[in-house]
């Protein structure tokens, strides 16, 4: 799997999980989240050569086509596969609220 | 939806469905498929600015972050959403076989 266990420990220019910290106020301008200050969101990046963690049969077709016709820009792309939620604390007036924001943390990647 | 009905009728630089014909022999080197000779595979391409058909909350976070730090290459990517199978005819010896290859045709796209 193209997850932290593999990607963070290896030199990998191909599609892989990359670490990325997001600060809510600084990076997104979100001042309504009280806790946490930020979180490890991660992201997916890297090349998708033929058969590198291909998501579907179409992805395989496209990556094979792309090797022959690179100028067509019809290549697969490295995107998130498994995502996890993030628990946040915010206030409505003086009332604290705890909520789970779904699909906030990328755990693994794929070529699609 | 970023499908043929919308994308093929509009000039759209952002993420959208793009037409692409694949000839099995010429483009993939697949000589085993007897019929069809090729098919309209289509593909997804284009920019993913903030809130353009965002797949998940993480996609929204990433596209917003990317406006501030484009050099991070941490931007969402335009990928396939809905896919359809393709029915093919091939031979094992002299025996014709009909099979459905799943996820061969892209019908719509998303930013992920």
């Amino acid at each position: 799997a193209l997850d932290a266990a593999y990607c963070f420990r290896n030199v990998q220019d191909n599609c892989c999980l990359r670490p990325l910290y997001i600060d809510f106020k600084r990076d997104l301008g979100w001042k309504w989240i009280h806790e946490p200050k930020g979180y490890n969101a991660n992201f997916c990046a890297g090349a998708c050569p033929y058969l590198w963690s291909s998501d579907t049969q179409h992805t395989k077709v496209l990556s094979l086509y792309n090797t022959i016709n690179p100028e067509a820009s019809a290549s697969p792309c490295c995107v998130s596969q498994d995502l996890e939620p993030l628990t946040i604390l915010y206030y409505i007036g003086n009332t604290p609220k705890i909520e789970q924001l779904s699909n906030m943390i990328v755990k693994s990647c794929k070529c699609s | 939806a970023l499908d043929a009905a919308y994308c093929f009728r509009n000039v759209q630089d952002n993420c959208c469905l793009r037409p692409l014909y694949i000839d099995f022999k010429r483009d993939l080197g697949w000589k085993w498929i007897h019929e069809p000779k090729g098919y309209n595979a289509n593909f997804c391409a284009g920019a993913c600015p903030y809130l353009w058909s965002s797949d998940t909350q993480h996609t929204k976070v990433l596209s917003l972050y990317n406006t501030i730090n484009p050099e991070a290459s941490a931007s969402p990517c335009c990928v396939s959403q809905d896919l359809e199978p393709l029915t093919i005819l091939y031979y094992i010896g002299n025996t014709p076989k009909i099979e459905q290859l799943s996820n061969m045709i892209v019908k719509s796209c998303k930013c992920s």
Epitope: V11, R26, A45 | A72, S73
Partner: antibody
Framework: QVQLKESGPGLVQPSQTLSLTCTVS????????VHWVRQPPGKGLEWMGL???????RYNSALKSRLSISKDTSKSQVFLRMNSLQTEDTATYYC?????????????WGPGTMVTVSS | DIQMTQSPASLSASLGETVTIECLAS??????LAWYQQKPGKSPQLLIY???SLQDGVPSRFSGSESGPQYSLEINSLQSEDAVTYFC?????????FGSGTKLEIK
């Protein structure tokens, strides 16, 4: 363990180009960002620029026209090139890593390499 | 660029005392502040990040705090090895900027 080490010429002529190498071990350049920071003798620290794990770069606007940062991930090396050097560029040059990309503080530093600009 | 005004430039204190070094940011940096210790001829070492988070392996006598745009580094029970130079750094906006440094001496 995580290590960074700078190397390059100790002496550079004015108007010439400075080339420095930062060789890292214990982590991958496709995972972490690397920054360059310099410190003139007896003075404070100046952030120069960084190279992202994905290869993108960002420079201090005061140095942008003269500065270039690149890397060779397979060799675990980051390179700094700065042209049109003047005596005020005399400094110790450090490479440093941020603990998570976009955290922007530096948890590991190289020992530094002293560069003197003089004729 | 965000200016970081660090004070005092130098400071003298006795062993066992508590000392405070301050940094004033020219604009809101939302707690994105780090503190470093630098020994002569050595590279800086991270002490504190996010204004108050202690870096792994750093003694607990070091602590960080904030009050509006003012950020502080406090060193309790001063020891002889603490007599070096300290820098603050804002990690909020490009270009990342440092304070001018505080040289701490033992009386």
């Amino acid at each position: 363990q995580v290590q960074l080490k700078e190397s390059g010429p100790g002496l550079v002529q004015p108007s010439q180009t400075l080339s420095l190498t930062c060789t890292v071990s214990g982590f991958s350049l496709t995972t972490y960002n690397v920054h360059w920071v310099r410190q003139p003798p007896g003075k404070g620290l100046e952030w120069m620029g960084l190279i992202w794990n994905t290869g993108g770069t960002r420079y201090n606007s005061a140095l942008k026209s003269r500065l270039s940062i690149s890397k060779d991930t397979s060799k675990s090396q980051v390179f700094l090139r700065m042209n049109s050097l003047q005596t005020e560029d005399t400094a110790t040059y450090y490479c440093a890593r941020d603990p998570v990309p976009n955290k922007w503080h530096f948890d590991f530093w190289g020992p530094g390499t002293m560069v003197t600009v003089s004729s | 660029d965000i200016q970081m005004t660090q004070s005092p430039a130098s400071l003298s204190a006795s062993l066992g005392e508590t000392v405070t070094i301050e940094c004033l940011a020219s604009e809101d940096i939302y707690s994105n502040l780090a503190w470093y210790q630098q020994k002569p001829g050595k590279s800086p070492q991270l002490l504190i990040y996010d204004a108050r988070s202690l870096q792994d392996g750093v003694p607990s006598r070091f602590s960080g705090s904030e009050s509006g745009p003012q950020y502080s580094l406090e060193i309790n029970s001063l020891q002889s090895e603490d007599a070096v130079t300290y820098f603050c750094q804002q990690h909020h906006a490009y270009p990342f900027t440092f304070g001018s440094g505080t040289k701490l001496e033992i009386k």
